[in-house]
């Protein structure tokens, strides 16, 4: 039997409280063949901002067609966790699942979606919904990439030299300058998967009085500027 899996698209909305919610579900164009079975096996990578809520969806198959619904969750450095619902007996079962923030959205017989409340760096991993029907399994897989917004600082540390830092971002931010200077960039990797990027630039040309540091990141972009003083100036700091 075919083992379909389908591409997804990120939709972001604001809930009533401050926490943003991402739903990795969509109506999509499907690849169909004999008997209208979907044959595409696609695992999709999706970025999700840290501290938001995320909802992951199964393929659109009615409960009346199902035997078992299983979510398989593989997180780095942990045993594979499975959450299963058996329709015939109306029972749910969990194996090796320790993170209480990863749950069914509601009763599986009403909604097969999986939710992650307050996404953390530790939720980086692979999530797969497996829908077992009498004629085979339908799959939908997600490679979840947790995004962390870096803290951006810009300061002058020597005569006509500025330092721009994007601290503890995930993935690493990209730093560029206007105007371009004589720059050196270093990256520092932390054990939790975040990266600090430090760019130090020097401008010999004396008609350059103001410089701008532009930080590009998947969570958003930020620009800071500073006046080049003959002596070290004030420190500037911002979140993306």
């Amino acid at each position: 039997a075919a083992q379909p899996n389908n591409s997804l698209m990120l939709q972001t909305s604001k809930e009533n409280h401050a926490l943003a919610s991402s739903s990795l579900c969509m109506d999509e164009k499907q690849i169909t063949q004999n008997y209208s079975k979907v044959l595409a096996e696609v695992n999709t990578s999706w970025p999700v901002k840290m501290a938001t809520n995320a909802v992951l969806c199964c393929p659109p198959i009615a409960l009346r067609n199902l035997i078992i619904i299983t979510w398989e969750i593989i997180l780095r450095g942990q045993p594979s966790c499975t959450k299963a619902y058996k329709k015939e007996t109306n029972e749910t079962k969990e194996t090796n699942c320790t993170d209480e923030r990863i749950t069914w959205v509601s009763r599986p017989d009403q909604n097969s979606d999986l939710q992650i409340r307050t996404v953390a760096i530790t939720h980086d991993g692979y999530y797969r919904c497996i829908m077992v029907t009498p004629d085979g399994n339908f799959h939908r897989g997600y490679h979840l990439q947790v995004l962390v917004t870096p803290e951006v600082t810009l300061f002058q540390n020597r005569n006509r030299t500025a330092v721009c830092k994007a601290v503890a971002g995930k993935p690493a931010a990209h730093i560029s300058w206007i105007p371009e200077g004589d720059c050196a960039t270093k990256q520092e990797y932390w054990s939790n998967g975040t990266v600090t990027v430090k760019s130090t630039c020097h401008w010999e040309v004396h008609n350059v009085s103001t410089v701008t540091c532009h930080v590009s990141h998947l969570t958003g972009n930020k620009s800071l500027y500073i006046e080049l003083l003959p002596v070290p100036g004030a420190k500037k700091s911002a979140k993306l």
Partner: antibody, heavy 119, light 110 residues
Framework: QVQLVQSGAEVKKPGASVKVSCKAS????????MHWVRQAPGQGLEWMGY????????NYNEKFKGRVTMTRDTSTSTVYMELSSLRSEDTAVYYC????????????WGQGTLVTVSS | DIVLTQSPASLAVSPGQRATITCRAS??????????MHWYQQKPGQPPKLLIY???NLESGVPARFSGSGSGTDFTLTINPVEANDTANYYC????????FGQGTKVEIK
Amino acid sequence: QVQLVQSGAEVKKPGASVKVSCKASGYTFTSYVMHWVRQAPGQGLEWMGYINPYNDDTNYNEKFKGRVTMTRDTSTSTVYMELSSLRSEDTAVYYCAREDYYGSRWGTWGQGTLVTVSS
Amino acid sequence: DIVLTQSPASLAVSPGQRATITCRASKSVSTSGYSYMHWYQQKPGQPPKLLIYLASNLESGVPARFSGSGSGTDFTLTINPVEANDTANYYCQHSRELDTFGQGTKVEIK
């Protein structure tokens, strides 16, 4: 290919019962839910209910509960729809339709069976 | 039960023009990012034929002149450009809960 072949036209008297058959071929019969829909002359489509041949589950439209029975025979890959206590307004073409998994859409239909209820 | 209301009841269109049929549900037929709304074409003496599933997906073998859109409670079937053999009745159907059909739209080609 997937095919649904229904039984022939029927003429029934009011109060009688009718049993329409729908024979499936070209796929694993027990794997797919089968729906029944009817269409009165010059009218729209009306869902009657479904049977899941895999586990014999049935679900009927409230309007037909108590009068309709859907059954299946796995040895002949056939589903049946029986409607009792017939009245003239039950005169219609009755269709079976197979539900495809993805999106619960109905991709394959029988050719239809005309049931006429007349005294 | 979810009630589906189609409009208009009938429609006359010239070949090459656009035909638009709408279907409104009494409550949302969308869940988990999917809209469980489908569109069928029925010609006289024939069973219905699936055109569009899950609101916007074209069934295999159906011409790209047919398209569907919408989510939640409001959906549209568009035929563009219309051809002479598109004369038929068109029905929306939902499978969010127990299945129901719209009352149908009769499309005639001028």
